[in-house]
């Protein structure tokens, strides 16, 4: 994400996703996102966050897990897991509130 200099200090993060422009990116924080789409294996993406920090507070579900951190390359060696499959009555929503 392009970030204006006035938006505070930037951190350098590992970038590993189909949309990365290089091996690292700079942002307000670092991210790891683990996503499992229907009928596919989970995919882990690493990158930078600049907007909607509230996603960092969302609890893991069987489909997605968001992780955020604030130091240099802090997302490099992080491995995430998804919640175990739950019965429909127990399923947590993905809403980050």
């Amino acid at each position: 994400d392009p970030v204006k200099p006035s938006r505070g200090p930037l951190v350098t993060c590992t970038c590993e996703s189909p949309h990365c422009r290089g091996p690292t990116c700079q942002g307000a924080w670092c991210t790891v996102v683990l996503v499992r789409e229907e009928g596919r294996h989970p995919q882990e993406h690493r990158g930078c966050g600049n907007l909607h920090r509230e996603l960092c507070r969302g609890r893991p579900t069987e489909f997605v897990n968001h992780y955020c951190c604030d130091s240099h390359l802090c997302n490099r060696n992080v491995s995430l897991v998804l919640e175990a499959t739950q019965t429909p009555s127990e399923q947590p929503g993905t809403d980050s509130q």
Epitope: D1, P2, V3, K4, S6, R7, G8, S17, P18, H19, A28, T31, V33, V35, H45, G47, N50, L51, H52, R53, E54, L55, G58, F63, V64, H66, G93, T94, D95, S96
Partner: antibody, heavy 118, light 108 residues
Framework: QVQLQESGPGLVKPSQTLSLTCTVS??????????WNWIRQHPGKGLEWIGY???????YYNPSLKSRVTISVDTSKNQFSLKLSSVTAADTAVYYC??????????WGQGTTVTVSS | ESVLTQSPGTLSLSPGERATLSCRAS???????LAWYQQKPGQAPRLLIY???SRATGIPDRFSGSGSGTDFTLTISRLEPEDFAVYYC?????????FGQGTRLEIK
């Protein structure tokens, strides 16, 4: 360039569920740079944010609508959708989808009018 | 939740004049994520300004944004006939995203 197009029924009966889809063309919905939003505008009124979804499927909703709103994403179809349950006449509005990044909501659909009436 | 209050509600000016629109937030806007949009009847909103002061692609330089913290301003230096519309400010730094109630800019 990226374009958004809303689609769905223009008339919904009270107590039913409003369902709309936004189709993204000219770009990937799976980019981590963007958040995909729904906004509505009641006749003659201002803009009301409904909620957003990230490519991961994570969502955030307007607290005033949270109990009735579900936003979902289908990355294989490059679409995201809005469901609003238990509608009343107060949900009659123009519904817009929009792409958001650090550069604001830079791409909007043209809007679709939904009327709630029996 | 950050409540945005725009003033004035209606602004009556003539082409060629300078327009100053105000937006006040109930709490400091996160990371300067404040935007301005223009909306004409029957059309979707159009992004004018993002990040307080950056012009969106294709926006003429007569539009400028300024401010910080809780007080923001959209200035149109010399009004053209096509500028008469409704203008909304928006904070998008943290959720819930909120819009101001709008300022209607009408021809005097």
């Amino acid at each position: 360039q990226v374009q958004l197009q809303e689609s769905g029924p223009g008339l919904v009966k009270p107590s039913q569920t409003l369902s709309l889809t936004c189709t993204v063309s000219g770009g990937s919905i799976s980019s981590g740079d963007y958040y995909w939003n729904w906004i509505r505008q009641h006749p003659g009124k201002g803009l009301e944010w409904i909620g957003y979804i990230y490519y991961s499927g994570s969502t955030y909703y307007n607290p005033s609508l949270k109990s009735r709103v579900t936003i979902s994403v289908d990355t294989s179809k490059n679409q995201f959708s809005l469901k609003l349950s238990s509608v009343t006449a107060a949900d009659t509005a123009v519904y817009y989808c929009a792409r958001e990044s650090t550069d604001g909501m830079d791409v909007w659909g043209q809007g679709t009018t939904v009327t709630v009436s029996s | 939740e950050s409540v945005l209050t725009q003033s004035p509600g209606t602004l009556s000016l003539s082409p060629g004049e300078r327009a100053t629109l105000s937006c006040r937030a109930s709490q400091s806007v996160s990371s300067s994520y404040l935007a301005w949009y223009q909306q004409k009847p029957g059309q979707a909103p159009r992004l004018l300004i993002y990040g307080v002061s950056s012009r969106a692609t294709g926006i003429p330089d007569r539009f400028s944004g300024s401010g910080s913290g809780t007080d923001f301003t959209l200035t149109i230096s010399r009004l053209e006939p096509e500028d008469f519309a409704v203008y909304y400010c928006q904070q998008y730094g943290s959720s819930p995203i909120t819009f101001g109630q709008g300022t209607r800019l009408e021809i005097k």
